[in-house]
Interface confidence: low
């Protein structure tokens, strides 16, 4: 009540919408065929939709994406020295999030 | 450089610091015995360290946490009926982070 | 305004070392990454060295490896070189410039130089 | 390492002349490729960017083509400024290298 003050505060719901996550930059996303070589920078921020809903019938979603091409530093390794590199990777971020009904498969008898 | 601009803009390493993260509340921090019911709300926000450091020798990890007791509903279904209870949650924030050396064990020779 | 103004050039022996400074100023230096580039007395440009924005990443042209140290100082903003076993072929002017971003790798902004003279 | 070869290595133009100066990379660096003017006794100025972007405050009449091994920096009329001598420069990988140099001259 008001002028109470617990030493527990309620809970809140995490709604569903856009946070800053962290995305790796996984090598495969530059290069499949050569594990001879760095990234720089390993990770970076991204927008992903994260949250509960009202229910567990449905789910937080990404309802609008935009993809984000970003110059990264392919570091190869050449006759041990340094080498650097461009690449380009593009990212996901999520600009808009829903509630949606989950639609599970009913088994097949 | 200043005052360029390219499409690709160059990739920004994701820092090591506090991001809002969802936490679930899993059944299992409110009543490991019984299974008969729900929690209210399923997930909230709690402050984590995320984030890159310049090596992979370490790792962005809490320098310091804090607890933080919150207030959830037990719903139970007794006789068909949901009854209405609390109980307390302790969550866990990061208040702030560092890069920390990782230490891994020699193998025995 | 931009400005990158080095210092520290000067006559010195061979095997002699000098250390040159750059100090930054109109622009967030704790942001950019930084390089020195170097020419000959009537040649072309060098590329010596690179530091980026934290500090923590260096890289250098063949010919400074091993003898030449960059570094650099964000609470002051300052960029610096520390030159060792100094050679004859070392003798140029020395600019410091900005270079941007993790993948950017050109120079933007360049101080005025300053001459570094190896000879006996 | 990568090596840029500029031709011509001195040219002679008048006023309001086009002018194209040529960059030719000893392989295929993408559009990573940059152009510097420099004037005697003073530092290099940027010019052009990622091979076409001019670079702020940079005059229109400058513009910069080309992709993989040969790019072209153009002065579409030459004024009294542009007298000077003009660099390319890789950004594709380390070490980064620089052409040896043009020099435009007064006729």
């Known amino acids: 009540s008001l002028g109470s003050l617990a030493a527990a505060e309620p809970a809140v719901i995490a709604e569903c919408k856009t946070r800053t996550e962290v995305f790796q930059i996984s090598r495969n996303l530059i290069d499949r065929t050569n594990a001879n070589f760095l990234v720089w920078p390993p990770c970076v921020e991204v927008q992903r939709c994260s949250g509960c809903c009202n229910n567990r019938n449905v789910q937080c979603r990404a309802s609008q994406v935009q993809m984000r091409p970003v110059q990264v530093r392919k570091i190869e390794i050449v006759r041990k020295k340094p080498v650097f590199k461009k690449a380009t990777v593009t990212l996901e971020d999520h600009l808009a999030c829903k509630c949606e009904t989950v639609v599970t498969p009913r088994p097949v008898t | 450089s200043l005052g360029s601009l390219a499409a690709a803009e160059p990739a920004v390493i994701a820092e090591c610091k506090t991001r809002t993260e969802v936490f679930q509340i899993s059944r299992n921090l409110i009543d490991r015995t019984n299974a008969n019911f729900l929690v209210w709300p399923p997930c909230v926000e709690v402050q984590r360290c995320s984030g890159c450091c310049n090596n992979r020798n370490v790792q962005c990890r809490a320098s310091q946490v804090q607890m933080r007791p919150v207030q959830v509903r037990k719903i139970e279904i007794v006789r068909k009926k949901p009854v209405f209870k609390k109980a307390t949650v302790t969550l866990e924030d990061h208040l702030a982070c560092k890069c920390e050396t990782v230490v891994t064990p020699r193998p025995v020779t | 305004e931009v400005q990158l103004v080095e210092s520290g050039g000067g006559l010195v022996q061979p095997g002699g070392s000098l250390r040159l400074s750059c100090a930054a100023s109109g622009f967030t230096f704790s942001s950019y990454w930084m390089s020195w580039v170097r020419q000959a007395p009537e040649k072309g440009l060098e590329w010596v060295s690179t530091i980026s924005d934290g500090g923590g990443l260096t890289y250098y042209a063949d010919s400074v490896k091993g003898r030449f140290t960059i570094s650099r100082d964000n609470a002051k903003n300052s960029l610096y070189l520390q030159m060792n076993s100094l050679r004859a072929e070392d003798t140029a002017v020395y600019y410091c410039?900005?270079?941007?971003?993790?993948?950017?790798?050109?120079?933007?902004?360049w101080g005025q130089g300053t001459l570094v003279t190896v000879s006996s | 390492d990568i090596q840029m070869t500029q031709s011509p290595s001195s040219l002679s133009a008048s006023v309001g002349d086009r002018v194209a100066i040529t960059c030719r990379a000893s392989q295929s660096i993408s559009n990573y490729l940059n152009w510097y003017q420099q004037k005697p006794g003073k530092a290099p100025k940027l010019l052009i960017y990622?091979?076409?972007s001019l670079q702020s405050g940079v005059p229109s009449r400058f513009s910069g083509s080309g992709s993989g091994t040969d790019f072209t920096l153009t002065i579409s009329s030459l004024q009294p400024e542009d007298f000077a001598t003009y660099y390319c420069?890789?950004?594709?990988?380390?070490?980064?290298?620089f052409g040896g140099g043009t020099k435009v001259e007064i006729k």
């Open positions: 990622a091979a076409s």
């Open positions: 410039a900005e270079s941007g971003g993790y993948t950017d790798w050109l120079f933007g902004y």
């Open positions: 420069q890789q950004s594709y990988s380390t070490p980064l290298t």
